[in-house]
């Protein structure tokens, strides 16, 4: 157990989140990190893998929800698999139905998450800010 | 103790934050809430206290990192003194220098918090969306 | 085994409408898009409306916009497509096809038989 | 809008025969083509996608190849149910659009 080194104790009337990396934002035990730093997909990728995480999935508007108030544009871990032509996240999984509304502003086979559930298609190599996510379990 | 009925063990690579409200919003061991429901100013503080928080106060532009991606405009704790001419906040304590941009859109002595730490002074009778905070001890 | 089956084809006058109707089984509806395509007798193939619920998008060829409204009951399995306004070259079979993914770049990987809508007065 | 040309129109050929069509974008569609098959009567067939991809169950006499603005269907050796027409059709971008056909017949 030499991991473990916090014992706390949670009143009922509240809840403790996580756990989540240090300084992440936890939020219905999922945890959050924005980054600031301009990064291809690829990289972007690789940074949230470093941590431990991957990049956002959206899996759930309810569960969510704090994603519809996010500004701007960043890359998510959604992937176009161009030979069934078919959206799909780094996990494999396919794009849950009335999730998200996906924008082709131009060719790519990458996803921009931008606030109120909205994909925006761009091209992988393009740089952009990027959210990682880690399921608690 | 019996408000208390769990106990949990934390990795220390990785830590719980809060204890929040249910559902609410933890990062860097703050708890903040966005509603949807539009208010005026007056409604959405007593809407805060109801549930133990109070309405948004900006202290730290670091600690509060979080609220520079906030999309849109919601009720903030932040108060113009018509007597002395200050922006305060609902504790009392003075705005300190550098968090905020105030913008004076129009008339008014309650102000609206937009991303990027600005201020928008607004009627304090009209209906907006509003952050509650809660501060952990 | 996929199947498309439509329905709701005939004879109409010009300005009137029509519903078209495709019944789909064996696939999960929700996750595929879905097209219609037409083929005026004796002539090729035009796309005419795509719709996918898992992306959220819908889109028309140029001839029918404003005209022609696709949608789906995800519930029911079924495609629909909501004719006003035809016009004499309207006419054609009208097939209901499944893309192999949730996006309008899959390529039409099942066809059902058609419908006829024939336009004249 | 893109266009697709096909060429041949019209094709007439023996069974055994190698047999090539070719398909033109009018720019360049990456490998977002797919080519059917369609028999008078029927529905049209999926027989390649992503231009070069062989659809489960269709024979391996017919193949594709191309990639950016021309594109070949090949039948290797005809066969007396391969006399149809045959489409291109492009989905790089909407709207979705088809080659004019090429009808393929006996000599």
């Known amino acids: 157990n030499s991991l473990f080194n916090q014992e706390v104790q949670i009143p009922l009337t509240e809840s403790y989140c996580g756990p989540c990396p240090k300084n992440w934002i936890c939020y219905k035990n999922n945890c959050y990190q924005f980054f600031d730093e301009s990064k291809n997909w690829y990289e972007s990728q690789a940074s949230c893998m470093s941590q431990n995480a991957s990049l956002l999935k959206v899996y759930s508007k309810e569960d969510q929800d704090l994603l519809k108030l996010v500004k701007s544009y960043h890359w998510m871990g959604l992937v176009h698999i161009p030979t069934n032509g078919s959206w799909q996240w780094e996990d494999g999984s396919i794009l849950s139905p009335n999730l998200l509304t996906i924008i082709e502003m131009q060719k790519g086979d990458c996803a921009l998450y931008a606030s109120s559930f909205k994909g925006y298609i761009e091209n992988c190599s393009t740089p952009n800010t990027y959210i990682c996510m880690q399921r608690t379990v | 103790n019996s408000l208390f009925n769990q106990e949990v063990q934390i990795p220390l690579t990785e830590s719980y934050c809060g204890p929040c409200p249910k559902n609410w919003i933890c990062y860097k061991n703050n708890c903040y809430q966005f509603f949807d429901e539009s208010k005026n100013w007056y409604e959405s503080q007593a809407s805060c206290m109801s549930q133990n928080a109070s309405l948004l106060k900006v202290y730290s532009k670091e600690d509060q990192d979080l609220l520079k991606l906030v999309k849109s405009y919601h009720w903030m704790g932040l108060v113009h003194i018509p007597t002395n001419g200050s922006w305060q906040w609902e504790d009392g304590s003075i705005l300190s220098p550098n968090l905020l941009t105030i913008i004076e859109m129009q008339k008014g002595d309650c102000a609206l918090y937009a991303s990027s730490f600005k201020g928008y002074i607004e009627n304090c009778s009209t209906p907006n969306t509003y952050i509650c905070m809660q501060r952990t001890v | 085994e996929v199947q498309l089956l439509e329905s709701g084809g005939g004879l109409v006058q010009p300005g009137g409408s029509l519903r078209l109707s495709c019944a789909t089984s064996g696939f999960t509806f929700s996750d595929y898009a879905m097209s219609w395509v037409r083929q005026a007798p004796g002539k090729g193939l035009e796309w005419v409306s795509y719709n996918s619920f898992s992306v959220g998008s819908t889109d028309y060829a140029d001839s029918v916009k404003g005209r022609f409204t696709i949608s789906r009951d995800n519930s029911k399995n079924t495609l629909y497509l909501q004719m006003n306004s035809l016009r004499a070259e309207d006419t054609a079979v009208y097939y209901c096809s499944k893309h192999s993914g949730n996006y309008y770049t899959g390529p039409f990987h099942y066809w059902g038989q058609g419908t006829l809508v024939t336009v004249s007065s | 809008d893109i266009q697709l040309t096909q060429s041949p129109s019209f094709l007439s050929a023996s069974v055994g025969d190698r047999v090539t069509i070719t398909c033109r974008a009018s720019q360049g569609i990456s490998s977002y083509l797919a080519w059917y098959q369609q028999k008078p009567g029927k529905a049209p067939k999926l027989l390649i996608y992503?231009?070069?991809s062989l659809e489960s169950g269709v024979p391996s006499r017919f193949s594709g190849s191309g990639s950016g603005t021309d594109f070949t269907l090949t039948i290797s050796s005809l066969q007396p149910e391969d006399f149809a027409t045959y489409y291109c059709?492009?989905?790089?971008?909407?709207?979705?659009?088809f080659g004019q056909g090429t009808r393929l017949e006996i000599k």
């Open positions: 992503a231009a070069s």
């Open positions: 059709q492009q989905s790089y971008s909407t709207p979705i659009t």
